[in-house]
């Protein structure tokens, strides 16, 4: 039960006090007791429950009431059973007793009121009225946890607007309200109660820019809302009528958790005594609700795909046809960004990452817009954000970004368990340098801070600065699997490729050509690739870089070797010793459920079939996966990217609720 106020009683004159239902009120009977009195007894109206803690009672009086010694060891507390119909309608009488004097009486007139701030603290999607209880003031994780949840109202329900809903202080319509969390103030008081008392709703100054609260005002024609708390307004006096009354508020978050904001927002209603005009208002009671802002959550390749995004650029019609066919097979919606909108920027994966936010009453996809800001920079905000599709961005919007700030360098693992630590929503993966140096690249600190602050997908830093482009999607991917952990980690593997080519040479296929069918490309014989010592040295270096990540991933994701599949791939070191794929990078694939869109490697044709394609199929088809090899050579590969780099996917949110985990 919540703590109420302290009431001091005195025999000199009656005391008037307010007692809020659900609170425990302390009664000070000692400090004003007559000097020659040594004990006291208590009589109450039926609506008041008094509890006296002292062991043992002094003596039982014949009337049935007990007396207790007046000493500091006595604790008197009272609670009320029901709200008062009129002011002071409940009475407590304290009788002080002494050896030589008749009893002296002190009177306390109590007004019982019900004042409670309620929200969906049980996370059921419904607001249940709660009396003032301690639990509302804390937010706890886990299946038995409690505490309300707020969504950042980061979608754009008004198609005419260019701004997010949370950027204005208006409620568009009932759709906009659904993005907010309901909070209800319940009051039950005597009719004249608010002539002498006032309620004020408030938020800490440090949190006022993170939240906006609308009060629903029931008009004759429609429900209208007005802002009562927000970035410019940390408190608001409420006009509450006497009697029984419910007041609804709609709460929206304005900011995601981040470095200086753990995501918790406390809204408090304070009851003030304003009866003495010549004195300042005094706080009689407070009730609070704590909300946590829902984190932005990424979805791994193992989640079912719902929508595929791709760019239309000069001469990529065949690529588009292949992606369209794959999306149809996977029963996905397809969104094509036309040339006039992408400004010759085909790297859809790099521009954005689509995740979601979730409260018990609502789930919303949210696009995280990278700060890379090239030709596609308007696409997330103009074409992706919209009604029930949110938007967030971080990092410098002008300059100061590196290649590692593109979201080909941002992936997430499927759910994993590492030792006895569970990651039911997986872990975020991004690439970094091995150590900071004058020219090393890393993901911008603002992006790293944002990702860490979401708490539910603890990030893992991988090493990717060894690559020309520097993205993790150049050496790893995840695919769904029917067994073990429900997925496999795919890693690009020069070792596996050399092994395959050596086997082919041993079988007499040393003259088979890589890049057959590619115009204006020097075709390479298997035997020449195997005998090129420089290329071998380069791939030995690449293998070491990938192996470093392999061990890191095994440790941080709790993987065994049998959870990993090596995809044959060669790299070459280019300027400044940065690596890029020697032939189309097969691990850079589009995963749509069981349907995989894999860059066509143009490997050596042996017995009428590309030996690289054959090898990859033999590794992935036993998992029930269907491999489609997409020709991206001229339009993507020679421009330092592949199928995954050129596409993006919105996936189904996890069925697991983020608040049920313990970060």
């Amino acid at each position: 039960m919540a703590q109420g106020t302290l009431i001091r009683v005195t025999p000199e004159q009656p005391t008037h006090a307010v007692c809020v239902l659900g609170t425990l009120t302390q009664l000070d009977v000692c400090s004003s007791a007559p000097e020659d009195c040594t004990s006291f007894s208590v009589n109450t109206s039926p609506g008041v429950v008094v509890d006296i803690a002292h062991s043992p009672p002094a003596k039982k009086k014949s009337t049935g009431s007990s007396t207790w010694p007046l000493d500091p060891g006595v604790e008197v507390t009272l609670t009320m059973k029901a709200a008062s119909g009129s002011t002071g309608d409940q009475k407590v009488q304290i009788s002080y007793h002494g050896p030589k004097t008749p009893p002296v009486k002190a009177l306390l007139y109590l007004t019982g009121v019900e004042i409670s701030l309620s929200a969906d603290i049980t996370r059921t999607g419904k607001v249940k009225p709660t009396r003032a209880v301690e639990d509302k003031r804390t937010w706890t994780w886990g299946p038995c946890g409690q505490g309300a949840i707020l969504l950042v109202n980061c979608d754009r329900d008004n198609p005419e607007s260019s701004a997010m809903d949370c950027e204005d202080d208006e409620v568009l319509d009932s759709k906009d309200l659904k993005d907010m969390s309901l909070m209800t103030l319940s009051t039950k008081t005597p009719q004249d109660f608010f002539t002498r008392h006032t309620l004020v709703l408030h938020v800490a100054r440090s949190e006022m820019d993170k939240v906006r609260v609308f009060q629903a005002t029931r008009g004759r024609l429609s429900s209208r809302c007005r802002v009562v708390l927000g970035p410019k307004q940390p408190s608001h006096y409420l006009m509450v009528p006497g009697g029984k009354h419910n007041m609804d508020f709609y709460v929206e978050a304005l900011a995601f958790p981040d470095t200086n904001f753990p995501g918790l927002i406390t809204l408090t209603v304070s009851m003030l005594d304003t009866s003495k005009l010549e004195l300042p208002e005094a706080v009689v009671f407070q009730d609070s609700v704590v909300f946590r802002v829902a984190p932005w959550i990424m979805t791994p390749n193992t989640q079912p795909p719902q929508e595929v995004y791709v760019c239309s650029i000069f001469e990529n019609e065949d690529f588009l046809k292949s992606v369209t066919a794959l999306a149809m097979q996977a029963r996905c919606k397809l969104t094509i960004c036309p040339e006039e909108e992408n400004m010759d920027d085909q790297w859809m994966q790099d521009e954005m990452e689509i995740g979601y936010i979730q409260a018990p009453h609502k789930t919303l996809p949210v696009v995280f817009d990278s700060p890379r800001n090239r030709g596609l920079k308007e696409f997330p905000i103009k074409r992706v954000m919209g009604p029930d599709f949110g938007y967030v961005t971080r990092g410098p919007q002008t300059g100061g970004v590196s290649g590692l700030d593109s979201f080909g360098n941002l992936e997430v693992s499927p759910p994993v368990t590492v030792g006895d630590k569970e990651y039911p929503l997986g872990r975020i993966l991004f690439g970094d340098s091995c150590y900071p140096s004058s020219d090393s690249r890393e993901m911008h600190q603002a992006l790293q801070d944002f990702l860490s602050a979401q708490q539910v997908q603890a990030p893992v830093k991988l090493y990717s600065d060894w690559l020309t482009v520097g993205h993790v999607d150049e050496f790893l991917s995840f695919v769904p699997a029917p067994d073990r952990k429900g997925f496999r980690l795919l890693l690009a593997s020069p070792r596996s490729c050399y092994k395959l080519f050596q086997e082919q040479q041993n079988e007499g296929h040393g003259d088979a050509l890589l890049f057959q069918g590619i115009k204006k490309k020097n075709q390479q014989k298997i035997k020449n690739i195997l005998s090129n010592t420089t290329l071998r040295e380069h791939n030995s270096f690449v293998e070491r870089c990938i192996d470093w990540n392999r061990e890191l991933l095994k440790r941080e994701l709790g993987l065994a070797e049998s959870d990993i599949i090596d995809i044959p791939q060669l790299f070459k070191l280019k300027e400044f010793s940065k690596a890029e794929a020697f032939f189309p990078n097969m691990v850079n694939m589009l995963v749509l459920g069981k349907h995989l869109g894999i860059p066509k490697p143009f490997g050596p044709i042996i017995n009428g079939r590309c030996c690289l394609e054959e090898k990859v199929c033999s590794l992935l088809e036993p998992l029930g996966l269907h491999c489609t090899f997409i020709n991206d050579f001229y339009t993507y590969h020679i421009r330092h990217g592949e199928v995954h780099c050129g596409t993006n996917v919105r996936r189904k949110p996890f069925s697991f609720k983020w608040w049920n985990m313990v970060p």
Epitope: T468, N522, L535, K572, L573, K574, E575, F576
Partner: antibody, heavy 128, light 111 residues
Framework: QVQLVESGGGLVKPGGSLRLSCAAS????????VSWIRQAPGKGLEWVSF????????YYADSVRGRFTISRDNAKNTVYLQMNSLRAEDTAVYYC?????????????????????WGRGTLVTVSS | QSALTQPRSVSGSPGQSVTISCTGT?????????VSWYQQHPGKAPKLIIY???ERPSGVPDRFSGSKSGNTASLTISGLQAEDEADYYC???????????FGGGTKLTVL
């Protein structure tokens, strides 16, 4: 063959800023590595900065790191050198140069380290 | 003070050969085969004449040749001609924090 033209030079006070542009014609600049090299009056060549064709990494000379930023806009076929906190010793003719990033090379050809095509240069004078 | 050391000047008569040296360290010339040479006439932009130690871009006469031994690279111009009079700069990739270094330049005078 690509042709390069630098612009944006001029007189600037110490502590000031300038943005140099290197516009390409005759070919798509996105296929080229681009470097900036400068030459103080009567002095030798000094390598300043580099950006790769994929626009994914940059390098700088110790003398300019933290003050200069190289960037490219492939749609505009232009590379930029943003120069902040300029000093008297930055006075020089600034040349833009490029080398083709040939995807056909089987191993590193070193094209990022030599300058195949040069512009005519633009003079930057830093003086109070 | 340039990172790569070149003689300030060399001279030769028409038809003769001259060699310009470029001395670096084990971290640049000695480590990489990414040495290039540039010719610069007064008031003009430099022109690439040798790359990757000894390779010549198309259009550069075969009188120009490059070589390397240890930490020193050399440019040899045989059959000197009057139009060869210019400043010559060597350059190398380096593993230092400035990844491309130039020499201080050598003034070639054709007597």
């Amino acid at each position: 063959q690509v042709q390069l033209v630098e612009s944006g030079g001029g007189l600037v006070k110490p502590g000031g800023s300038l943005r140099l542009s290197c516009a390409a014609s005759g070919s798509t600049l996105s296929d080229y590595f681009v470097s900036w090299i400068r030459q103080a009056p009567g002095k030798g060549l000094e390598w300043v900065s580099f950006i790769n064709s994929a626009n994914t990494f940059t390098y700088y000379a110790d003398s300019v790191r933290g003050r200069f930023t190289i960037s490219r806009d492939n749609a505009k076929n232009t590379v930029y050198l943003q120069m902040n906190s300029l000093r008297a010793e930055d006075t020089a003719v600034y040349y833009c140069s490029s080398a083709n990033d040939d995807v056909d090379d089987i191993v590193a050809p070193g094209r990022g380290y030599y300058m195949d095509v040069w512009g005519r240069g633009t003079l930057v004078t830093v003086s109070s | 003070q340039s990172a790569l050391t070149q003689p300030r000047s060399v001279s030769g008569s028409p038809g003769q050969s001259v060699t310009i040296s470029c001395t670096g360290t084990r971290g640049d010339v000695g480590r990489y085969n990414h040495v290039s040479w540039y010719q610069q006439h007064p008031g003009k932009a430099p022109k690439l004449i040798i790359y990757n130690v000894y390779e010549r871009p198309s259009g550069v006469p075969d009188r120009f040749s490059g070589s390397k031994s240890g930490n020193t690279a050399s440019l040899t111009i045989s059959g000197l001609q009057a139009e060869d009079e210019a400043d010559y700069y060597c350059s190398s990739h380096s593993r230092s924090s400035t990844p491309v270094l130039f020499g201080g330049g050598t003034k070639l005078t054709v007597l």
